[in-house]
């Protein structure tokens, strides 16, 4: 094997150059340092076959498989993948090694498999085998970001321990309330892990990857704002970091801020202060209280005091395990056809929940809004007045919660009829559930007033279609009514509907539909 060339195989992961959500740009801006894939001679193979270490790639990532050949003279080559071939253009690097690359853009499962590179040099022929697979998405995680103080700097680092590595961004807003909604012009986004500008009104950090987006808000007490009617409450699990920011603005610098836990000053090393002048020359001070890893005894009332402002407190509760508190009893609603109505669930939860609304096996996005009293609310209004069973499902890392709702729409019955050789049946989904009458139409009763009571079998709510009750009535055929027209009528407090059927007709034969209010 003296003549065999020296082969080096490397993997280059392309850095994503675009910051938009779900975007995997198709070309490399900056490359991570190449990863050596070994490329050992494969034993017991016919011909000379080098095998590179297996490569695992995230869905939609872009990579380059590269071979460096230290062999004299020119080389020619061909890539083969799944019976398709691709010409390759070898070039030479500064060390005069032949370089052959296969760039795979926006990786998909279809592009996973064995890539064979056939190389012909003046001295010998050989094959290089790369096996590329998609990283198992079951191993993907997306964890809520948390904050750390940057060493020796007045800055916060946002960390999310997620796979694949998430894109981290700070979401900043200097307005109050509604205008700090995600898409508001008042919102500024900074795609970086470190934040130095910590004086803003509303500061959140968000992390996003394949699995979605998770955000954490920097808990803030603003001494210039009127305190909430209920004491703000912050939940944390044992071991999580605690960060509370106290913010105050005053006409001059002659004021100071302090933190106390249950009337005891925080120890040094558990707080740090920053100050700046605002545009109108007023002084803004912020004082952070932080604990890198909370224990049960960090529970209590944290009070921020100022020499020039009324003090304000927050209750910090440390729990062993996450929770979702809400009433899970099922609720039934009855509304008119054009009445505006929303389902709503009020809950208290930590960590923040992920939730869905489900109707007829279809899931709908779930929005949640924080209330001032520490509770959150999720509303669902997109029912389009469809009666049935609606399900609210919420979960976080530690708890699950499901609540059922039934929606009934008040409306007059609508009748569908079908007939077979032995019986006629009518169905209605009006609400309240209708009652039934059957009438026979004959020479004696051209207006179909002769009531039929024999052989009638009513089934109220015989089948539940996605929670929607259906009522039916069946008339068994007798000689007395064979060949006649019969009429089934369904009625409730909102009106009556009828359907006329010719008995003894082949197959379903709804004849005339009468709508009688």
């Amino acid at each position: 094997n003296q003549d065999l060339p020296v082969i080096k195989c490397v993997l280059i992961n392309h850095k994503n150059n675009d910051s938009s959500v779900g975007k995997s740009s198709s070309y490399p801006m900056v490359s991570e340092s190449p990863e050596d894939l070994g490329c050992a001679l494969r034993p017991q193979s016919s011909g000379t076959v080098y095998e590179a270490a297996a490569v695992e790639v995230d869905v939609s990532a872009s990579i380059t498989l590269q071979v460096l050949v230290d062999a004299p003279g020119n080389i020619s080559c061909l890539w083969v993948f799944k019976h398709s071939s691709l010409n390759c253009q070898p070039h030479f690097d500064l060390q005069n090694r032949g370089v052959v690359s296969m760039v795979i853009l926006k990786m998909t499962e279809t592009q996973a498999g064995e890539y064979l590179l056939f190389i012909q040099s003046e001295a010998t022929n050989y094959t290089i085998l790369f096996t590329v697979s998609i990283r198992n998405t079951l191993l993907y995680t997306l964890r809520r970001p948390y904050f750390r103080k940057m060493e020796n700097q007045d800055a916060l680092v946002c960390i999310s321990e997620s796979v694949p590595e998430p894109i981290v961004e700070w979401v900043l807003c200097d307005s109050q309330g509604e205008s700090c909604k995600e898409e508001s012009p008042a919102v500024v986004k900074k795609e970086e892990k470190v934040l130095h500008e910590l004086f803003g009104t509303d500061i959140r950090c968000c992390a996003r990857n394949e699995l979605g987006r998770e955000c954490t808000r920097l808990f803030t007490i603003d001494l210039n704002q009127t305190p909430q009617t209920t004491l703000p409450q912050l939940f944390l699990k044992v071991g999580e970091p605690l960060w509370i920011r106290c913010k105050a603005v005053h006409v001059n610098h002659g004021f100071g801020l302090t933190w106390e836990l249950e009337n005891k000053a925080l120890e040094e090393g558990n707080y740090f202060e920053m100050s700046t002048y605002s545009t109108n020359r007023t002084m803004i001070r912020i004082l952070f209280a932080f604990v890198s890893s909370v224990a049960r005894n960090d529970t209590g009332y944290y009070t921020c005091s100022s020499s020039k402002h009324p003090s304000q407190s927050a209750l910090v509760t440390i729990v062993e395990k996450g929770f979702i508190n809400a009433t899970n009893s099922s609720e039934d609603y009855e509304i008119d056809q054009y009445e505006e109505f929303c389902f709503s669930v009020r809950f208290k939860a930590y960590p923040q929940i992920r939730c869905t609304w489900t109707f007829s096996r279809k899931s709908f996005p779930c929005e949640q809004k924080g209330l001032d009293n520490g509770y959150s609310i999720s509303k669902f209004c997109n029912h389009k007045h469809q009666p049935g069973e609606y399900i609210f499902h919420a979960e976080n890392d530690d708890a699950q919660f499901t609540k059922m709702f039934t929606l009934n729409i008040r409306r007059k019955p609508q009748v569908l009829a079908e007939a077979s050789a032995s019986q006629a049946s009518c169905f209605s989904d009006g609400y309240p559930l209708p009652s039934w009458t059957w009438k026979k139409c004959s020479d004696k009763s051209p207006n179909c007033t002769e009531e039929i009571t024999e052989g009638v079998w009513n089934r109220k709510a015989n089948r539940k279609v996605f929670g929607q009750w259906v009522s039916s009535s069946t008339l068994n055929m007798s000689e007395a009514i064979k060949g006649f027209l019969v009429k089934c009528c369904a009625y409730n407090s909102l009106g009556t509907s009828c359907e006329t059927i010719l008995l003894n007709s082949p197959g379903p034969f709804p004849f005339i539909q009468d709508n009688i209010s």
């Epitope: 280059i12 675009d18 779900g22 975007k23 995997s24 740009s25 198709s26 070309y27 490399p28 869905v59 939609s60 380059t64 590269q66 993948f81 799944k82 398709s84 691709l86 010409n87 390759c88 253009q89 070898p90 070039h91 370089v99 052959v100 690359s101 296969m102 760039v103 795979i104 853009l105 926006k106 998909t108 499962e109 279809t110 592009q111 998405t137 394949e210």
Partner: antibody
């Protein structure tokens, strides 16, 4: 064999939205990008964007952000593009296409869906 | 965005002769020596049809009369010899950088 079958021509009013479907047969869309291309007479071909149905991941041409959104239903092997707030500029033939194994070059195309926006 | 400029805009060639269409990119469409330039043929009322992928690879089922060459910013599609069935508009397309872009097209006619 691989085929992409698009929904029929649409005549729409300005301001309305339209949803075009692209049903694939002969392969599974979940692990292949589906590209969407616009063609207007005299304007050549324009890439609108793409979706990878299995992951729901989508990439948009900045020019069409807010105009086009992509969805897919892997159970019916169908991809969709929705065009919103239609204007006469959106009158065009829209194609779906599948990139080949080596990426970027589109080897299978739908027959195209003509969208006409007129009041 | 990468702008692709095709020339000529239209081309008339005699049957059996060579047709050459050029496509110039406003920046390189190569990544590690891989050229992400592709060529399509489109006839009226039909979708485009892939002829050449990654600069020089002939799509399966396409006659060998079609060939592609070039790298970085300059690419060429050659049809030799031209047949009557080749009357169509030809487009180049790059996929090296989002957004993918197409050339303005070259209309091929028979002299």
């Amino acid at each position: 064999q691989v085929q992409l079958q698009q929904s029929g021509a649409e005549l729409m009013k300005p301001g309305a939205s339209v949803k075009i479907s692209c049903k694939a047969t002969g392969y599974t869309i979940s692990s292949n990008w589906i590209e969407w291309i616009k063609q207007r007479p005299g304007h050549g071909l324009e890439w609108i964007g793409e979706i990878l149905p299995g992951s729901g991941r989508a990439n948009n041409n900045e020019k069409f952000k807010g105009k086009a959104s992509f969805t897919a239903d892997t159970s019916s092997n169908t991809a969709y593009i929705q065009l919103s707030s239609l204007t006469s500029e959106d009158s065009a033939v829209y194609y779906c296409a599948r990139p080949n194994l080596f990426g970027g070059a589109m080897d299978y195309w739908g027959q195209g869906t003509s969208v006409t926006v007129s009041s | 965005d990468i702008v692709l400029t095709q020339s000529p805009a239209s081309l008339a060639v005699s049957l059996g002769q060579r047709a050459t269409i050029s496509c110039r990119a406003s920046e390189s469409v190569d990544t590690y020596g891989n050229s992400f330039m592709h060529w399509y043929q489109q006839k009226p009322g039909q979708p485009p049809k892939l002829l050449i992928y990654r600069a020089s690879n002939l799509e399966s089922g396409i006659p060998a009369r079609f060939s592609g060459s070039g790298s970085r910013t300059d690419f060429t599609l050659t049809i030799n010899p031209v047949e009557a069935d080749d009357v169509a508009t030809y487009y180049c397309q790059q996929s090296n950088k989002d957004p993918w872009t197409f050339g303005g097209g070259t209309k091929l006619e028979i002299k």
